[in-house]
Amino acid sequence: KNSFTKLSIEPAFTPGPNIELQKDSDCCSCQEKWVGYRCNCYFISSEQKTWNESRHLCASQKSSLLQLQNTDELDFMSSSQQFYWIGLSYSEEHTAWLWENGSALSQYLFPSFETFNTKNCIAYNPNGNALDESCEDKNRYICKQQLI
């Protein structure tokens, strides 16, 4: 298990003053309570849910749990110490870690992924750290909508 410590209490995320978030730019117009950054929209929850509940909540907003393209994708919230459920789970059928859309996890994203317990789900910290935890644990979560 990775040795990152989880902080149990942190206020709901608010972007820092130096972060340039997009508001109704050419490629990015996000609904209320969502954050626009680099032509994606993100919903950063303040509630704690199980992984499956989080997945359903994202789906009900026509989005999916966060699928990371690279580790600096969440630069806009790098001040957060919180861990969030993301859309990564182990597929017994494919014997691989898959994102919600079915694509495989790049080994370069989380070099330590081979130590993850395949029965667990993945929680991610915007500084680039990932933890495997029981899917029944409750965490905040991040939903993502790609606009382009």
Epitope: E32, R55, S60, Q61, K62, G87, E100, N101
Partner: antibody, heavy 121, light 113 residues
């Protein structure tokens, strides 16, 4: 719990205001819907409103005639029915979205018992 | 709008036997970003409001007996009652919540043979 009221007999072209009193959950946290069912027929979704009340959608069949609204201070959902037609005769149900306020792509986990609206001369 | 078509319109099944209801959508209700099917099943008994049975095509609502199951993906879905009980006599509806307007199938009436 959801309890509808306000149904009744109304003439074509008339108006009616339905209400749905909610209890047992944090009303403002959930989008709410109206669904209707004509006698002996299937279910037809009518309208949805976000938890805050600032976003609404409705079916083409009622657009411009029906207006959904809510009063979160009173835990009450409303449906204003104007320019009523015979084909609007139905039991009107209010139904709670399963997920949160801004989630419109939802199934309904709680329904009221319904209130009957009859449009006839 | 997405049109939901259910078959058959009615179904008579012996007690303890399997009942199968089909639902077809005019376009896919599978969202590629999360591979989830935006489809629910409801049961409605006479004089009562509908009652949620299944959501996300195959997730059983809590409290619903495990003889009810949902399957399918994309445009073709099935509700199965593995062993019909007397209390299962009702009309069953599928609903898509992939896009607004939300739409329901026409219903399937299940009776005892």
């Amino acid at each position: 719990q959801l309890v509808e009221s306000g149904g009744g007999l109304v003439q074509p072209g008339g108006s009616l205001r339905l209400a749905c009193a909610a209890s047992g959950f944090t009303f403002s946290n959930y989008a709410m819907n109206w669904v209707r069912q004509a006698p002996g027929k299937g279910l037809e979704w009518v309208s949805v409103i976000s938890g805050s009340g600032d976003t609404t959608y409705c079916a083409d069949s009622v657009k411009g005639r029906f207006t959904i609204s809510r009063d979160n201070s009173k835990n009450t959902l409303h449906l204003q029915l104007n320019s009523l037609r015979a084909e609007d005769t139905a039991v009107y149900y209010c139904a709670k979205n399963c997920y949160g306020s801004g989630s419109y792509y939802n199934h309904f986990d709680y329904w009221g018992q319904g209130t009957l609206v009859t449009v006839s001369s | 709008e997405i049109v939901m078509t259910q078959s058959p319109d009615s179904l008579a099944v012996s007690l303890g036997e399997r009942a199968t209801i089909n639902c077809k959508s005019s376009q896919s209700v599978l969202y590629s970003s999360n591979r989830m099917n935006y489809l629910a099943w409801y049961q409605q008994k006479p004089g009562q409001p509908p009652n949620l049975l299944i959501y996300w095509a195959s997730t059983r609502e809590s409290g619903v007996p495990d003889r009810f199951s949902g399957s399918g993906s994309g445009t073709d879905f099935t509700l199965t009652i593995s062993s019909l009980q007397a209390e299962d006599v009702a009309v069953y509806y599928c609903q898509q919540y992939y896009s607004i307007p939300l739409t329901f199938g026409g219903g399937t009436k299940v009776e005892i043979k």
